[in-house]
Every structure is written in C-alpha cells, then in structure tokens.
C-alpha cells in the first residue's frame, strides 16, 4: 500500500513538476527590468527564451519573436537546449510511468516490469528535473553578470548634462517557477526511484515439502530460491547533490495605488 | 470612434475644490490608461498624472502632489479629476487624454476650462 | 524630471517652403527593449485640442499627411515639414514618453509671413 502512495505521489509531483517546466520555458518573463530606485516605469522591458516584451503604461505590450538562431547568444541557446531536453525526457518519463502505476493493470504485466519501468521512469525525472534547474540557474548566472556589468556604467555622461540610462535586467518570474518545477520533477523522480524498490520481489520462499520413500524415511528439503530481479536489497543509494547557483532573495517592488514621480 | 467627452466650463473660488468629468467611448475602457493634461492660457503643456481602469493604479507628477487626485468609475466609463484648495494659478484648460502606442497621447478631450477668481 | 528643450521657440515661414523644428531632451528617450525612442511631436491649432502627429520618434499617426517626417534618435529629434501649407499654421510640441512624470517641450509656434 505504502509502495502504492510512494508511487503515485512521485507520478503526480513529477506530472506537476512538469507541467512547471513547459509554463517557466513558455514564459517570457524570464528576465524582467530591474526598477532599482523607480518602481514606476512608463515603459517596461521584460525578456523570455523566445521573445522579448515591453510594456507600456499606456496599456500596449508588444512583443518580438527572436528570428535569429545563429544571432543569438549561445548561452540562450544553450538554456532552450537544457529546457526542450528537460521536457521531452520528463513526457516519455510520465508516458512510461503511467503503464509502471501500480494501480493500473494492462495485460499479465509482472511487478518486476512494473518495477524496472518505475525506475526507468525515476531516472528520467531527475535527469528532467535537473536539466530545468540547470537551465535556470544558467539563466540565472548570465543575468547576474549581465546585471553588475551594466551596473558598473549605469550612467555614461554624454556632454555633461546629458545623460543615457542604461536598462538592467533581473529575475523574471519564469525563473522561480523553472527551479520550484525542476525540484518537483527531480523529487518526483526519487519518489519513484524509492517505489521501485517496494515494487522488487525481494524472494519467494517455498515451503519444505516432504517426500516419504516406501523404505527409508528420507526428507528432500529444496533450498530457498532468489527471485532474480536484479534489484537487491543490497542496492545502494547514491546521493544526487544540486550544484545550483544560489542567489539572495529578491524583494519585487510593485507599484501601488498612488505614486509619485 | 473613439471620445472623450469632458464636462462644462467650472467658476470656481480660490480655496474651493472642483470635480472633472471624462466620459470615454468607442473603445474598451478597461484596456487603456487616461492621462490629464493641465495647458494655461498661451503657455504649454504640463501632465498631472494618469490612471489605469482595469486595476486603478494611478502615478502623479509630483509637482501635482495634493493638488489633483484621479479616480475612476469603470461601470460608467468615466474618469473623474478633483482639483483641491484652488488659486488662481491653477486657472487653466484641464484636457483627458487617451494613451496609445509609444506613450502618446492620440485622443484629446474637448478640455475643460477652469476659472478661479474671487 | 527629463526636460525637453525646442528651438526655434517661433519660426515664421512662407507656402510651400521647407521646416526644420528641434527637439533635445536631457536624457535618452532610446529603449533598448525594443528599440524605439519615446518621443511624441503634437500639432495644436489656436482654441483646439493637441493632435497626435509623429509617435516613436519617426511613427506618423494614421491619417496625417506625409509632409510630417519626424526623426532622430537618443537626446535629438527633428520635425520637417516637406512642403509647408496654410494649414499648418500652428503650435508644435515634442513630449517624452519614456519616463514619468510626461514632460513637454515649450513649443514652435509656425507662423506665416
């Protein structure tokens, strides 16, 4: 029963870890211009993996596909990579785990089937699930980068007087959702890792069983056999350490009822 | 099409306080934000802040800071502007205006002339 | 504030000849977002309302006559009037869109000789 839940649950974190991944890839907030000292901007910059935004207070957004591949830098392409990976290997993972359920019952299908396609299933959600957070914290890094480059000449004086401001850009909503979505999907994963190991019959004891010769009173007792499956009880359990990029908590200023410029 | 009507001529007396009137049509209210404009007789033209009906967030030049206050009632598709503690320098032609792309103002209000005197 | 400076302040002309109003603003109205400026150029003729002429710095508003070009980029706009007409006696003004609070320029009253 425990076995059932473990492996449900790890289907269903997994299915909504996800789900995550494909709305933080669909966003376009990934990077959104950072307010600093003006939390109200008549016109804002918001970028994601496949278009870049802005908002203006009049009430238009605008946004423009990139309609570049080779334009583009190759750590967005390399975040896009990470991202389609991440989701075409969790699809086939949830695909192959909804015939792994224990609860469903397709054909004569044996438990040590059922067991190995938990596990295969697993694997793919943590490698899914890390290929998100990998993808986001790539992200994440070139932001940071490009954040304090741009900081560095925020403003480049122009004749004195004039003075050119120049856009930074810091985490976009789509990049929190990516590593809540990447960590759901790789706790999915070992959810149905752990289930795997219920599902594996450990061994099947048959009973001794005696024969009485006409003569001699000779007990055959056939030794206990080991089911075969390739799952052990002597298995072992490998830790997976997430080498994500950790950031300090952004506070977003939003705009209140009434403010003065 | 789209309309801005405003409402009538006010007298006012210095000290006094005055509600203005923007009736919007012809477009989805909600969609667009409404910007007051404040032109004195012969001069130029000063923004006093804007309001935006779908969520009624509204920013003020601060040069306006307690002197104008904008609301707006998104049944009616009406904008309102409250001018407080009137003198006679904020005698002037009050217009709404409509946002539109690049943050310009495409559609203008007849505008409401506003007079303070004693 | 950014602070939108025209010149001339009154430019006085003959028919059909051509016109060349300036507009500086005290910072950048570039957004690099999407690579626009947020400079807006209005028409106002005596006792009427303003009218949206030329938005994003070059964009004419639908419905006005080709002889309005507007241009520049950064802190420097130009308006030009190819072939200027009798109709075109007016007051124009330039405002940032860029960044609040909406600021305007003082005007260029077109007159005629």
């Known amino acids: 029963m425990a076995v059932t839940a473990c492996q449900g649950l790890g289907f269903v974190v997994s299915l909504i870890g996800i789900a995550g991944i494909i709305a933080a890839t669909c966003m376009d907030q990934w990077s959104t211009q950072d307010l600093y000292n003006n939390p109200v901007t008549a016109v804002f910059n918001y970028q994601g993996l496949w278009r870049s935004c802005v908002r203006e207070s009049s009430g238009f957004t605008e946004c423009r596909g990139y309609f570049t591949l080779l334009g583009l830098p190759a750590m967005l392409q390399a975040v896009r990579a990470l991202m389609i990976v991440g989701i075409v290997l969790g699809a086939i993972g949830l695909l192959v785990s909804i015939f792994a359920l224990k609860c469903i019952r397709i054909g004569s299908m044996e438990d040590s089937a059922k067991a190995n396609m938990t596990l295969t299933s697993g694997i793919m959600f943590i490698v899914s699930g890390l290929c998100a957070i990998a993808g986001v914290s790539v992200f994440a890094n070139m932001l940071v980068t490009n954040f304090w480059m741009s900081t560095a000449n925020m403003y480049t004086g122009m004749g004195g007087m004039v003075q050119t401001v120049q856009t930074r850009y810091t985490f976009g909503a789509a990049l929190f959702v990516g590593w809540v979505a990447g960590g759901l999907t790789l706790i999915g994963g070992v959810m149905m890792c752990i289930a795997c190991r219920g599902l594996a019959p450990e061994e099947t004891n048959y009973k001794a069983v005696s024969y009485h010769a006409s003569g001699h009173s000779v007990a055959y007792k056939p030794g206990g056999f080991k089911a075969s499956t390739g799952f052990g009880s002597n298995t072992k359990n490998k830790k997976i350490y997430d080498g994500g990029a950790r950031t300090e908590d952004e506070v977003q200023s939003y705009p209140s009822k009434h403010d003065y410029v | 099409q789209v309309q801005l009507q405003q409402s009538g001529p006010e007298l006012v007396k210095p000290g006094a306080s005055v509600k203005l009137s923007c009736k919007a049509s012809g477009y989805s209210f909600t969609n667009f934000d409404i910007n007051w404009v404040k032109q004195r007789p012969g001069q130029g033209l000063q923004w006093i802040g804007r309001?935006?009906?779908?969520?009624?967030?509204?920013t003020y030049n601060e040069k306006f800071k307690g002197k104008a206050s904008l609301t707006v009632d998104t049944s009616s598709t009406t904008s309102y502007m409250d001018l407080h503690s009137l003198t006679s320098e904020d005698s002037a032609v009050y217009f709404c205006?409509?946002?539109?792309?690049?943050?310009?103002?495409?559609?203008w209000g007849q505008g409401t002339l506003v007079t303070v005197s004693a | 504030d950014i602070v939108m400076t025209q010149s001339p302040s009154s430019l006085t002309v003959t028919a059909r000849e051509k016109v060349i109003m300036n507009c500086k603003s005290s910072?950048?109205?570039?957004?690099?977002?999407?690579?626009?400026?947020?400079l807006t150029w209005y028409q106002q003729k005596p006792g009427q309302s303003p009218k949206l002429l030329i938005y994003w710095a070059s964009t004419r508003q639908s419905g006005v006559p080709d002889r309005f070009t507007g241009s520049g980029s950064g802190t420097d706009f130009t308006l030009t009037i190819s072939t200027v007409q009798a109709e075109d006696l007016a007051v124009y003004f330039c405002q940032n869109g860029f960044s609040f609070p909406y600021t305007f320029g003082g005007g260029t009253k077109l007159e005629m000789n």
């Open positions: 910072q950048s109205l570039f957004n690099s977002g999407n690579q626009k400026n947020y």
């Open positions: 309001l935006y009906p779908r969520d009624g967030t509204t």
């Open positions: 205006v409509r946002g539109n792309y690049g943050n310009s103002f495409a559609y």
